[in-house]
Interface confidence: low
């Protein structure tokens, strides 16, 4: 079980929001918070260990997912083309 | 990591280059293809993944395709060749953890002249 | 389309001396970019991947740095066998921007 700790979102960049969120996770061992269908979730650790976030399904239904070429997080296409880029620090 | 097939060609003719390597496996790691024209910078052509997948430079999308032959082989298509594509083309093995090619093979020619 | 603007285009340096050679892109590429020198009929070969990650027997005098859309190769007292021409090759996602590569900085030696 997952919830949303912290969300800020800042919407000062013209064509661009950038939203900053922290969730608490309560998960089995073995597995870690992650992102699964846009929403928090537990995910298996060696998705996180190997950083092959896409495993993770962390896009909605029928968005297309590719990992950041220095492995720092993902991006999400929607079917119109619009991109969502997601970081984890 | 070694390519050949590079020739002269005739403007229109299609070409296809072979990248050959020995010491590690196509089903583990990224292959890109980089083109170079006679004393100028390099170009990013496309890569494909362990998986199959690939991906391309918008100026290559259509004219330019790779594919994966063996575990050890891997293709460059190209099709209506014109004098613009003439260089020496790069095979590089790409790492997977970033966009850092580690390991190139020498080169091969394309002329295209008529 | 991503565009990396490369700067200088050629620079002529002292034995000793600390270079630097700047790589701006368009947009953010996460620290997407990696360094290379090559010289004459020879391929590149590669100094620097993810921004500032030194390739393993690559001399220490090469360093890497930035973040965002702004990045620098440092070449920290600049030696003979450093004349060569340096790109830089930055993108963050092969499905949107793909890689592309600057126009290159040809570094001499006096």
């Known amino acids: 079980t997952c919830e949303i700790v912290t969300l800020d979102r800042d919407s000062s960049q013209p064509r661009r929001t950038i939203a900053r969120q922290t969730a608490r996770c309560a998960c089995r061992k073995g597995q870690i918070a992650g992102t699964t269908r846009a929403r928090p979730a537990c995910v298996d650790a060696r998705i996180i260990k190997t950083k092959q976030w896409c495993d993770m399904l962390p896009c909605l239904e029928g968005e297309g997912c590719d990992l950041l070429i220095n492995r720092s997080g993902w991006t999400c296409t929607q079917p119109g083309g619009r991109i969502k880029t997601t970081t984890v620090s | 990591v070694e390519e050949s097939g590079g020739r002269l060609v005739t403007p229109g003719t299609p070409l296809t280059l072979t990248c050959t390597v020995s010491?590690?496996?196509?089903?583990?790691?990224?292959m890109s293809w980089v083109r170079q024209a006679p004393g100028e910078g390099l170009e990013w052509i496309g890569i494909?993944?362990?998986?199959?997948?690939t991906y391309y430079a918008s100026w290559a999308k259509g004219r330019f395709t790779i594919s994966k032959t063996s575990s050890t082989t891997v293709e460059l298509k190209m099709t209506s060749l014109t004098t613009e594509d003439t260089a020496t083309y790069f095979c590089?093995?790409?790492?997977?953890?970033?966009?850092?090619?580690?390991?190139w093979g020498p080169g091969t020619l394309v002329t295209v002249s008529s | 389309e991503l565009v990396m603007t490369q700067t200088p285009p050629s620079l002529s340096a002292s034995v000793g001396e600390t270079v630097r050679i700047r790589c701006l892109a368009s947009e953010d590429i996460y620290s997407g970019i990696s360094w290379y020198q090559q010289k004459p009929e020879k391929p590149p070969t590669l100094l620097i991947s993810?921004?500032?990650n030194l390739e393993s027997g690559v001399p220490p005098r090469f360093s890497g740095s930035g973040s965002g859309t702004d990045y620098t190769l440092t070449i920290g007292g600049v030696q003979a066998e450093d004349a060569a021409t340096y790109y830089c090759l930055g993108g963050y996602s092969y499905s949107s921007t793909g890689l592309t590569f600057g126009a290159g900085t040809n570094v001499e030696i006096k």
């Open positions: 494909i993944y362990p998986s199959t997948t």
């Open positions: 010491g590690f496996s196509l089903s583990s790691d990224y």
């Open positions: 590089a093995r790409g790492s997977n953890w970033s966009s850092g090619m580690n390991l």
């Open positions: 993810g921004a500032s």
